[in-house]
């Protein structure tokens, strides 16, 4: 069976197909979750949709083989198998990993440590997001690009305010926050 | 008529390896999922591994994942069960099943006992 | 995993009498995706009933099975001398497929 991987935002309507045509005159054709767990099964001229977690919000489109879901959530993260039961009695299958993400929300940038050293303002921020496994990516008047959730900087004696945007993002969104200071070692904005 | 006939069980040591065979007729193979059922001595039924009919995907109950490999050839007509690491409550009669259309097993083929002690 | 549970254990019984089985599911079962099986001493299991209802090929109408939801019953209309058996039940609602421990139908 050939593997294909899918990331979408949930919440979002989700076509899963195959990018090849189906065999000619298939006998049957059923979508599964799981191994054996059926969405619906086409035979015999009729769809029959399956008491599941799917039920109503799905939809089988017989001639491509394209399974169509409605609003779909984090619960919904599974490895789906199109199974098709050939003219010659023999069975070819698909299968589409479907990764469901959040969107990102809004980080916090918090202030860890921020003190004058030598006329130097020393700041140590954090970009916090509850519980996601996201990238995180610092822009800004910084040295190089930093991609942690932390970012540790030092700056010199400046007349402007600097400002640093931490980008979180995952495969589906991204989110921006922004902290500024204001000379010599003051947090003005976010 | 549908036949299923297993092979290949017998007396093992703790630790040691096994392969068992099922040889199917009367139908086409290769339409049809496939499932290995074990029993242990006076106890009940055990659902152990299926497979797919195109042999693209397998599952395994909890007890048996990582030591026990379903595999099949459609070419043969043949299902296979290789064990490993072999444990005394592995001790059954293995029986093979078609897995009609991913609901229930049948038929049943006879089953083949593996016994394993030192 | 929904686990099943068979009661009785074990019946005697005498041939021509009636006989109810019964299999509860510790979850709803799925559209009755409920399955019975005989098995004679020696013997591989046999598909009696598929659906909760519907009687596998050549299985003869005194067996018949009922239920829907947790609460499922096989139910032999006039035992016949072979159908003293171990019957078991299974799902397939949910994964894993899973069986009951099984109810003995035994002469008494």
């Known amino acids: 069976g050939r593997l294909v991987h899918m990331t979408v935002v949930s919440g979002s309507n989700v076509t899963l197909n195959i990018s090849e045509s189906l065999p000619e005159n298939y006998k049957q054709l059923t979508w599964f979750y799981t191994f054996d767990q059926k969405i619906v099964e086409w035979d015999s001229g009729k769809s029959k949709y399956f008491e599941s977690k799917f039920k109503g919000r799905v939809r089988l489109d017989p001639q491509s083989g394209a399974l169509y879901i409605s609003k779909v959530q984090k619960e919904d993260n599974s490895t789906y198998v199109m199974r098709v039961l050939k003219k010659d009695g023999y069975e070819q299958e698909w299968k589409i990993k479907l990764q469901v993400l959040d969107p990102v929300p809004k980080p916090v940038i918090k202030i860890e440590k921020r003190e004058d050293v030598d006329d130097n303002c020393y700041l140590k921020l954090s970009c916090v997001i509850p519980g996601e496994s996201v990238n995180y990516t610092w822009y800004g008047e910084l040295p190089k690009e930093i991609q942690n959730s932390v970012l540790e900087t030092t700056l010199k004696p400046h007349k402007h305010s600097r400002c640093y945007t931490c980008q979180v993002s995952n495969s589906v969104s991204s989110k921006n926050g922004t902290f500024c200071f204001s000379p010599p070692c003051t947090a003005a904005r976010s | 008529e549908v036949q299923l006939l297993e092979s290949g069980g017998g007396l093992v040591h703790p630790g040691g390896s096994l392969r068992l065979s099922c040889a199917a007729s009367g139908f086409t193979f290769g339409g049809y999922a496939m499932s290995w059922v074990r029993q242990a001595p006076g106890k009940g039924l055990e659902w152990v591994s299926l497979i797919s009919g195109s042999g693209g995907s397998t599952y395994y109950a909890d007890s048996v994942k990582g030591r026990f490999t379903i595999f099949r050839d459609n070419s043969k007509n043949t299902l296979y069960l290789q064990m490993i690491s072999l444990r005394a409550e592995d001790s059954a009669v293995y029986y093979c099943?078609?897995?009609?259309?991913?609901?229930?097993?049948?038929?049943w083929g006879q089953g083949t006992l593996v016994t394993v002690s030192s | 995993e929904i686990v099943l549970t068979q009661s009785p254990g074990t019946l005697s019984l005498s041939p021509g009498e009636r006989v109810t089985l019964s299999c509860r599911a510790s979850?709803?079962?799925?559209?009755?995706?409920l399955a019975w099986y005989q098995q004679k001493p020696g013997q591989a299991p046999r598909l009696l009933i598929y659906?909760?209802?519907s009687r596998a090929t050549g299985i003869p109408d005194r067996f018949s099975g009922s239920g829907s939801g947790t609460d499922f019953t096989l139910t032999i209309s006039r035992l016949e001398p072979e159908d003293f058996a171990v019957y078991y039940c299974q799902q397939y609602g949910s994964s894993p497929r899973t069986f009951g421990q099984g109810t003995k139908v035994e002469i008494k």
């Open positions: 099943a078609k897995y009609s259309n991913y609901d229930y097993f049948d038929p």
């Open positions: 979850q709803s079962v799925s559209s009755s995706y």
């Open positions: 659906g909760a209802s």
